[in-house]
C-alpha cells in the first residue's frame, strides 16, 4: 500500500513543498514521485519511505506517489493548490465628469487570481459596497450601475479583490484598483441669459452680463464671452448655483458693423452658448454749413447741413427734401437774424433703433448803426432843479459807441443821473459809431423853470 | 447667395496706376465691411487694405500707405482699390472679402485677379 | 510683434487626427479665424470665433485656443483636407488691422 504526506498543500505560487511517499512493505522493488515539477530527494535511512522536495509550483498540480511491491503495484497522490492575488484590478476609464440624474456604469476587469473559487470581486464607492460577485473568467468582470446624485461629488469608486484562504489557514488577501474620482455637475438645458446694449457706438463702452442659475458645482464653471474676435475678460461673481459675469466692452472703429455676442458656460463635457447680435455704429453729430459765420445785413446766407450717408436730417425742424443726409435753407440777412441758431437734427436707424444727433451754429449779422425815435427820443423837457437819467440807446452789431454832444464839446451825459440845471439845455448832436458806419441824431433837451408866485 | 467677382488686374509698368473693382452680390453691401487681400505667387496671404460698411473709416497695410486707396460706391455694391507708384512687390493675386465688420474675419472670398507689374 | 507664427509643413495618415498650431502675442486678446486654400483656389474660411464653423465645413474641423496659441484640428482627415493652412487675426500690435500667418502645407498621406 502507497501513501502520501501531505495529501493536500495550499501553497504561494512558485513555492516549494516536502512530499513523504511511503509504502506499507519493507522491501519495495520501486518507491518514486511522479511530477512534471523540479523535485530534489532527501536522503533518509530505509527503504520504505522517501522525501522530496518539490519546487517553483506555478499551477495547480497532482503529484502521485507509487510503490512496487511483492504483493503488487500502488499509487496515492497529493494535491497541490497554488495561490496568487491577481495581477490586473482596475476599472475602466470614464470621464472624470458625469452629469446628475445619469447611469454610470463600473466595470471592474480582474486579470489572474487563484484559485478563483476564493476570489471575490467587489465595487466600492468609499467604504460602501455596491456589489459583490465570484471572479468568473478571464479575465473576470463585474459590473454595476450608479445613478448619479449631486452628492456623489467627489465621491471615490474602486473595485476590490478578497481572496479568501482563511479555512485553509492562511489570511485574506486584498488588492485594490487606483480610485477613480466622479466629479458630477448640473448644466441646466436653459441657455445663459445675455444682457447687452443691442447697438454701440464707436468710441464707447458698454456693459455686457451674462448669467445663470442651476449650476452645480458652480465655482467649477467656465465663462467665455466674447465679441466678434476679441475676448473680454469678465468679472465673476459666484452664488450658491449661480453665476453672474460682467465685462466692459470698448469699441473702436475697427469694430464697425454687426458682432456676434457670445456667452458661453462650460462645465464637465458640456457646453450652453447663448448668441446676441450687436450693431457697432459711427455716427457723428450732423455738420451745420454757414456760407459765413459773420454777414453784413443784407447779404445772402447759405445754410446745409450734412449727415451720416444713410441718416435722415431736419433744419430748424424743416425736414430735408427729398428726405435724407442732406439740408440747406437761403436767407437775406437782417438785423433780426443775428444770434439766429440753425438746428441741424440727424436721426439714424441702427438695427431698428432711432439714434438721434444734433448741431447747432450761430448766425452773426453785421449791422447798423442805428438810432431812432424809440431808443434815443428827440425831445426832454425837464423841470429844473429835477433829479433826471438822460437815456439814448444805439443798436448795432458790433455794438456803437454813442457820444452826444452840445456845441460840439459840452458832453450829454447818457445814462447817468444828473441834477437838471440851465446849463443842461440846448441840442445836442448824439453820434453812433462802428465798424459798419456812422449815423447822427439831434436831441434837444429843454428846462423848465420853477414858478414864482 | 454671396458673390465677389474682381476686375482690373493686369500687367502694369513699374510706378504706374491700376483701379482694381470688386462687384459684391448676395448681401447686404452696405452692411458689410470689405478688405482687399493679396497673395504674391507661391507666397503667403497679406492684408491690404479694409474700409467700413458706411465708407468712412479705412485703414492700410504699412507696406501700401500712400500708395493705395480703397473705396466702395454702396449704390452700385462695388468696391474700388486705386493703385498708384506700383512696384514689382506689389505683383500678387488681389482677393476681395467681406466681414461682418471692419475688424472681422472674412466670411466670403472672390476669385482674385493678378496684377503683375513689370520693370 | 504683430506676427503669426506657423509650421511650414505638416502631414498626417489618411483617417487620423492632425493639429496646425498659431502662435502669437494678439491670440491673448483676440481669437484666430482658419482659412483653407487649395491649388489655385481663393481663400475658404474653415473656422472663427472660439470654435465656430461656417455652413458648409464638416465637423472633423475644430478650433481651440489657449494662451497666445491657436489651433486648428481636423479629426480623421480626409485626401480632399490636403491645401494650405492659415491663421489670421486682429493685430493688437496697432500697425495692422488684421494679420495672416505664413500657412501650413498639410499632406494626407495614403
Known amino acids: 500500500q502507497t501513501s502520501v504526506s501531505p495529501s493536500k498543500v495550499i501553497l504561494p505560487r512558485g513555492g516549494s513543498v516536502l512530499v513523504t511517499c511511503s509504502t506499507s512493505c519493507d522491501q519495495p522493488k520501486l518507491l518514486g514521485i511522479e511530477t512534471p515539477l523540479p523535485k530534489k530527494e532527501l536522503l533518509l535511512p530505509g527503504n520504505n519511505r522517501k522525501v522530496y522536495e518539490l519546487s517553483n509550483v506555478q499551477e495547480d498540480s497532482q503529484p502521485m506517489c507509487y510503490s512496487n511491491c511483492p504483493d503488487g503495484q500502488s499509487t496515492a497522490k497529493t494535491f497541490l493548490t497554488v495561490y496568487w492575488t491577481p495581477e490586473r484590478v482596475e476599472l475602466a476609464p470614464l470621464p472624470s465628469w458625469q452629469p446628475v440624474g445619469k447611469n454610470l456604469t463600473l466595470r471592474c476587469q480582474v486579470e489572474g487570481g487563484a484559485p478563483r473559487a476564493n476570489l471575490t470581486v467587489v465595487l466600492l464607492r468609499g467604504e460602501k459596497e455596491l456589489k459583490r460577485e465570484p471572479a468568473v473568467g478571464e479575465p473576470a468582470e463585474v459590473t454595476t450601475t450608479v445613478l448619479v446624485r449631486r452628492d456623489h461629488h467627489g465621491a471615490n469608486f474602486s473595485c476590490r479583490t478578497e481572496l479568501d484562504l482563511r479555512p485553509q489557514g492562511l489570511e485574506l488577501f486584498e488588492n485594490t484598483s487606483a480610485p477613480y474620482q466622479l466629479q458630477t455637475f448640473v448644466l441646466p438645458a436653459t441657455p445663459p441669459q445675455l444682457v447687452s446694449p443691442r447697438v454701440l457706438e464707436v468710441d464707447t463702452q458698454g456693459t455686457v452680463v451674462c448669467s445663470l442659475d442651476g449650476l452645480f458645482p458652480v465655482s467649477e464653471a467656465q465663462v467665455h464671452l466674447a465679441l466678434g474676435d476679441q475676448r473680454l475678460n469678465p468679472t465673476v461673481t459666484y452664488g450658491n448655483d449661480s453665476f453672474s459675469a460682467k465685462a466692459s466692452v470698448s469699441v473702436t472703429a475697427e469694430d464697425e458693423g454687426t458682432q456676434r455676442l457670445t456667452c458661453a458656460v462650460i462645465l464637465g463635457n458640456q457646453s450652453q452658448e447663448t448668441l446676441q447680435t450687436v450693431t457697432i455704429y459711427s455716427f457723428p453729430a450732423p455738420n451745420v454749413i454757414l456760407t459765413k459765420p459773420e454777414v453784413s445785413e443784407g447779404t445772402e446766407v447759405t445754410v446745409k447741413c450734412e449727415a451720416h450717408p444713410r441718416a435722415k436730417v431736419t433744419l430748424n425742424g424743416v425736414p430735408a427734401q427729398p428726405l435724407g443726409p442732406r439740408a440747406q435753407l437761403l436767407l437775406k440777412a437782417t438785423p433780426e437774424d443775428n444770434g439766429r441758431s440753425f438746428s441741424c437734427s440727424a436721426t439714424l436707424e441702427v438695427a431698428g433703433q432711432l439714434i438721434h444727433k444734433n448741431q447747432t451754429r450761430e448766425l452773426r449779422v453785421l449791422y447798423g448803426p442805428r438810432l431812432d425815435e424809440r431808443d434815443c427820443p428827440g425831445n426832454w423837457t425837464w423841470p429844473e432843479n429835477s433829479q433826471q437819467t438822460p437815456m439814448c440807446q444805439a443798436w448795432g452789431n458790433p455794438l456803437p459807441e454813442l457820444k452826444c454832444l452840445k456845441d460840439g464839446t459840452f458832453p450829454l451825459p447818457i445814462g447817468e443821473s444828473v441834477t437838471v440845471t440851465r446849463d443842461l439845455e440846448g441840442t445836442y448832436l448824439c453820434r453812433a459809431r462802428s465798424t459798419q458806419g456812422e449815423v447822427t441824431r439831434k436831441v434837444t433837451v429843454n428846462v423848465l423853470s420853477p414858478r414864482y408866485e | 447667395q454671396v458673390q465677389l467677382q474682381e476686375s482690373g488686374g493686369g500687367l502694369v509698368q513699374l510706378g504706374g496706376s491700376l483701379r482694381l473693382s470688386c462687384a459684391a452680390s448676395g448681401f447686404t453691401f452696405s452692411s458689410y465691411a470689405m478688405s482687399w487681400v493679396r497673395q504674391a505667387p507661391g507666397k503667403g496671404l497679406e492684408w491690404v487694405s479694409a474700409i467700413s460698411g458706411s465708407g468712412g473709416s479705412t485703414y492700410y497695410a504699412d507696406s501700401v500707405k500712400g500708395r493705395f486707396t480703397i473705396s466702395r460706391d454702396n449704390s452700385k455694391n462695388t468696391l474700388y482699390l486705386q493703385m498708384s507708384s506700383l512696384r514689382a512687390e506689389d505683383t500678387a493675386f488681389y482677393y476681395c472679402?467681406?466681414?461682418?465688420?471692419?475688424?472681422?474675419?472674412?466670411?466670403?472670398w472672390g476669385h482674385g485677379t493678378l496684377v503683375t507689374v513689370s520693370s | 510683434s504683430s506676427e503669426l507664427t506657423q509650421d511650414p509643413a505638416v502631414s498626417v495618415a489618411l483617417g487620423q487626427t492632425v493639429k496646425i498650431t498659431c502662435q502669437g502675442d494678439?491670440?491673448?486678446?483676440?481669437?484666430a479665424s482658419w482659412y483653407q486654400q487649395r491649388p489655385g483656389q481663393a481663400p475658404v474660411l474653415v473656422i472663427y470665433?472660439?470654435?465656430s464653423r461656417p455652413s458648409g465645413i464638416p465637423d472633423r474641423f475644430s478650433g481651440s485656443s489657449s494662451g497666445n496659441t491657436a489651433s486648428l484640428t481636423i479629426t480623421g482627415a480626409q485626401a480632399e483636407d490636403e491645401a494650405d493652412y492659415y491663421c489670421?487675426?486682429?493685430?493688437?500690435?496697432?500697425?495692422?488691422?488684421?494679420?495672416f500667418g505664413g500657412g501650413t502645407k498639410l499632406t494626407v498621406l495614403r
Open positions: 489670421n487675426s486682429r493685430d493688437s500690435s496697432g500697425n495692422h488691422l488684421r494679420v
Open positions: 472679402a467681406n466681414s461682418a465688420y471692419t475688424g472681422g474675419w472674412y466670411d466670403y
Open positions: 494678439s491670440l491673448r486678446t483676440y481669437y
Open positions: 470665433g472660439e470654435n
